[in-house]
């Protein structure tokens, strides 16, 4: 059920999940100098049913030096709404998956969390791509990738997006980099089923992406 590989890499593009399918896990990791509280959670889990899903567990970090200080931030509903709005500013914004049944929205930050987030995506997860600042999109199809299960193996579909520099002339079809088919890698190249994957993101903001839907940069 969990996806094995990272979503495909597109040159000069980043991807973002608008919402996370039930079953998705997020590691509770702390930044240098901090550690999980005693008996703290190892990960958060998007749990629930088709009508309502939410993140189970809270990630809590405490100073490695001070044993008893614990700090954890859980935004109030208003703050969550505000954060969500910030993520939804792009004119190319896809459907708000956070309102879809069986999905969780981006988990709120916790104090002293690690600079990288590790997600474990599940089959059916969709991620959206957008060109980084200074590059524009040449679309040949959906700028998204979905984790699918075929013949007992997980794979990500290939997003149909090319990012070209603002000053560059558009590439002619014959000059385009070869792209995998929308259905992803050929079956012969698809690795055997693995049931878990951790995905890394950096929680540091990208410099200035005025129309960006991304509050986090995925690697």
């Amino acid at each position: 059920e969990l996806c094995d590989d990272d979503p495909p890499e597109i040159p000069h593009a980043t991807f973002k999940a608008m919402a996370y399918k039930e079953g998705t896990m997020l590691n509770c990791e702390c930044k240098r100098g901090f550690r999980r509280i005693k008996s703290g959670s190892l990960y958060m889990l998007c749990t629930g049913n088709s009508s309502h899903s939410s993140w189970d567990n809270q990630c809590q970090c405490t100073s490695s030096a001070t044993r008893n200080t614990t700090k954890q931030v859980t935004p109030q509903p208003e703050e969550q709404k505000e954060r969500k709005t910030t993520e939804m500013q792009s004119p190319m914004q896809p459907v708000d998956q956070a309102s879809l049944p069986g999905h969780c929205r981006e988990p709120p930050p916790w104090e002293n969390e690690a600079t990288e987030r590790i997600y474990h995506f599940v089959v059916g997860q969709m991620v959206y791509y957008q060109c980084v600042q200074g590059y524009r999109a040449l679309h040949r199809g959906p700028a998204e990738s979905v984790c699918k299960m075929t013949h007992g193996k997980t794979r990500w579909t290939q997003p149909q997006l090319i990012c070209t520099g603002e000053m560059e002339t558009s590439q002619f079809p014959g000059e385009e980099k070869p792209q995998a088919s929308p259905e992803g890698r050929p079956e012969s190249e698809t690795s055997c089923l693995v049931t878990t994957t951790d995905f890394q993101i950096q929680t540091e903001m990208a410099a200035t992406m005025e129309t960006s839907i991304f509050t986090t940069e995925y690697q």
Epitope: D6, E29, S39, G40, S41, E116, I118, V194, D198
Partner: antibody
Amino acid sequence: QVQLQQPAAELARPGASVKMSCKASGYTFTTSTMHWVKQRPGQGLEWIGYINPRSGYTEYNQKFKDKTTLTADKSSSTAYMQLSSLTSEDSAVYYCARHYYFDYWGQGTTVTVSS
Amino acid sequence: DIQMTQSTSSLSASLGDRVTISCRASQDIRNYLNWYQQKPDGTVKLLIYYTSRLHSGVPSRFSGSGSGTDYSLTISNLEQEDIATYFCQQGNTLPPTSGGGTKLEIK
């Protein structure tokens, strides 16, 4: 096919250190956390700690914090666990296991501490 | 730390039997319960995670249930290859802890 390969056995003297390996194949090493588990004969499984190979982030069971050092070499897709100041209590089978669910396990390394 | 107790350390059953192995946690573990099978040669495999989710490749005769502090693993139709020791483990509260194991034998 996911595989975690561990040496079958390691022999060490009391007071010495031992460093055992766990070579991963069949998946991208940096996309999953690697955990280490201790099992004494006829006993249960004791979680030692884990490492996130991508970032080097580690988390230890307090019981093993001063005894154990976890590292990972991305270039060879290998995780390592070093045990220091060995005593007879450290004689056990040590397993590496992938991900929080421990979905795939190595065959285990039997560590014997003996003079 | 959370204590996990498997009150039955060994269990005898006949091939074809329905076998249930129980596990109790010292506090509510909110379904973060995994089951592992350890063969006599030491090989360990994940069977069930998050109380009832069957790991890939595990036969459907294995199932898990429970909530709060009490959990169980059921083998609906015991086969020779199921002879092993079964461990429960709470998998989300630091540190993860396991029961002492239940050794399953053939009558």
